[in-house]
């Protein structure tokens, strides 16, 4: 004969545990029903009556099957440097993530506690490590034959254009300027003598907490807080 299915509340067999979505109530010494996500235990079970569940109130939630007397409070509203990627509902907490152009300098269990603006590389420096959701941009000096003339959290150093006749040679922060003949972005092999790369580094500058004006993309979603790199700047 099949074993009879026990209905909650019931006393468990010695040495056995309660079933899935049930909990053992120490006071009643019975297996009782848990409340579903979005609910909490309004009245605990007794030897003769099961748990009474009730819906979570506004701005509170429970994410798991539970027997908590009160639902958890949703986190505070997202700050201005964040976007709400998951709303507060009866079954889930609000999740705030950093908006484009910012990264998470201090994370919490879900979402981000503190966002910081992505470092911007100043002219003469380019992005050597793009930012992600959780790591800042790394800037490095432009190598000989390349330049960056922008203050940007996304721009890498680019090769100088190649002129038939050079009006102004390029440097780390400026492209070459050609005379009226049309430029290309190529060079004949061995046609250029690259100078030694710069070995000086510029002063550290702290990024300012203004939002980034550099073009942001879905890729700007980067490791943790780091001191500003040389060659970085704020607006």
């Amino acid at each position: 004969l099949p074993a009879q299915v026990a209905f909650t509340p019931y006393a468990p067999e010695p040495g056995s545990t309660c079933r899935l979505r049930e909990y053992y109530d120490q006071t009643a010494q019975m297996c009782c029903s848990k409340c579903s996500p979005g609910q909490h235990a309004k009245v605990f079970c007794t030897k003769t009556s099961d748990t009474v569940c009730d819906s979570c109130e506004d701005s509170t939630y429970t994410q798991l099957w539970n027997w908590v007397p009160e639902c958890l409070s949703c986190g505070s509203r997202c700050s201005s440097d964040q976007v709400e990627t998951q709303a507060c509902t009866r079954e889930q907490n609000r999740i705030c993530t950093c908006r484009p152009g910012w990264y998470c300098a201090l994370s919490k269990q879900e979402g981000c506690r503190l966002c910081a603006p992505l470092r911007k590389c100043r002219p003469g420096f380019g992005v050597a490590r793009p930012g992600t959701e959780t790591s800042d941009v790394v800037c490095k000096p432009c190598a000989p034959g390349t330049f960056s003339n922008t203050t940007s959290s996304t721009d890498i150093c680019r090769p100088h254009q190649i002129c038939n006749v050079v009006a102004i040679p390029g440097n780390a922060s400026m492209d070459a300027v050609c005379t009226s003949t049309s430029p290309t972005r190529s060079m004949a092999p061995g046609a250029v003598h690259l100078p030694q790369p710069v070995s000086t580094r510029s002063q550290h500058t702290q990024p300012t907490p203004e939002p980034s004006t550099a073009p942001s993309t879905s890729f700007l979603l980067p490791m943790g807080p780091s001191p500003p790199a040389e060659g970085s700047t704020g607006d």
């Epitope: 150093c157 070995s199 980067p222």
Partner: antibody, heavy 118, light 109 residues
Framework: QVQLVQSGAEVKKPGASVKVSCKVS????????IHWVRQAPGQGLEWIGR????????EYAPNFQDRATMTTDTSTSTAYLELSSLRSEDTAVYYC???????????WGQGTTVTVSS | QAVVTQEPSLTVSPGGTVTLTCRSS?????????ANWVQQKPGQAFRGLIG???DRAPGVPARFSGSLLGGKAALTLSGAQPEDEAEYYC?????????FGGGTKLTVL
């Protein structure tokens, strides 16, 4: 001129570790990432990782996260790659390089042959 | 880890045009993958040809060009020369690491 000079060939037993060095000259080592790439016999390139000599920060390919350690000594302008728990599949030529898909500062060491054999 | 796939081998006639491609297992290649192309000739040092998807590195002839084509990174060689016979590797950036493709052996015949 810019040069990256690597240490000599190594023969190791499975399970052992190897440490390859790469001495750079002609530029400030702090200005560019140093990459490590390997090429097994008759195979393509495999990126191991890169280290920022300025602060020691490293980024590894997922396959090397647990076995590779990249370090630099800025006082001697030398980068190091240590690979542990060697197996026969690690037999390859290991290159250090300033090649970085972000910089166009494109110099490579001469390569260090590591042979793993019992 | 992402897998980057290239044609194992291609052949082009001298003076002809050929396009090498680079596919990502994670979806379309975008500018955020900063596609790079590296050339390896037998017995010679590696040489970066293209960076940032479409920028020729200093010293690279104009016959080499980089682009995105149908969700893949592409290297087009227009007016192939005998000296262009080599192995070509693409490299794609994935958030915090580079992945090289298996390489394309280009024969100029």
């Amino acid at each position: 001129q810019v040069q990256l000079v690597q240490s000599g060939a190594e023969v190791k037993k499975p399970g052992a570790s190897v440490k390859v060095s790469c001495k750079v000259s002609g530029f400030n080592i702090k200005d560019f990432y140093i990459h490590w790439v390997r090429q097994a016999p008759g195979q393509g390139l495999e990126w191991i990782g890169r280290v920022d000599p300025e602060d020691g920060n490293t980024e590894y390919a997922p396959n090397f996260q647990d076995r590779a350690t990249m370090t630099t000594d800025t006082s001697t302008s030398t980068a190091y790659l240590e690979l542990s728990s060697l197996r026969s599949e690690d037999t390859a030529v290991y290159y250090c390089s300033t090649w970085d898909g972000f910089s166009y500062f494109d110099y490579w060491g001469q390569g260090t042959t590591v042979t793993v054999s019992s | 880890q992402a897998v980057v796939t290239q044609e194992p081998s291609l052949t082009v006639s001298p003076g002809g045009t050929v396009t090498l491609t680079c596919r990502s297992s994670t979806g379309p290649v975008t500018t955020n993958n900063y596609a790079n192309w590296v050339q390896q000739k037998p017995g010679q040092a590696f040489r970066g040809l293209i960076g940032g998807t479409n920028d020729r590195a200093p010293g690279v002839p104009a016959r080499f060009s980089g682009s995105l084509l149908g969700g893949k990174a592409a290297l087009t060689l227009s007016g192939a020369q005998p000296e262009d016979e080599a192995e070509y590797y693409c490299a794609l950036w994935y958030r915090n690491h580079w992945v090289f493709g298996g390489g394309t052996k280009l024969t100029v015949l």
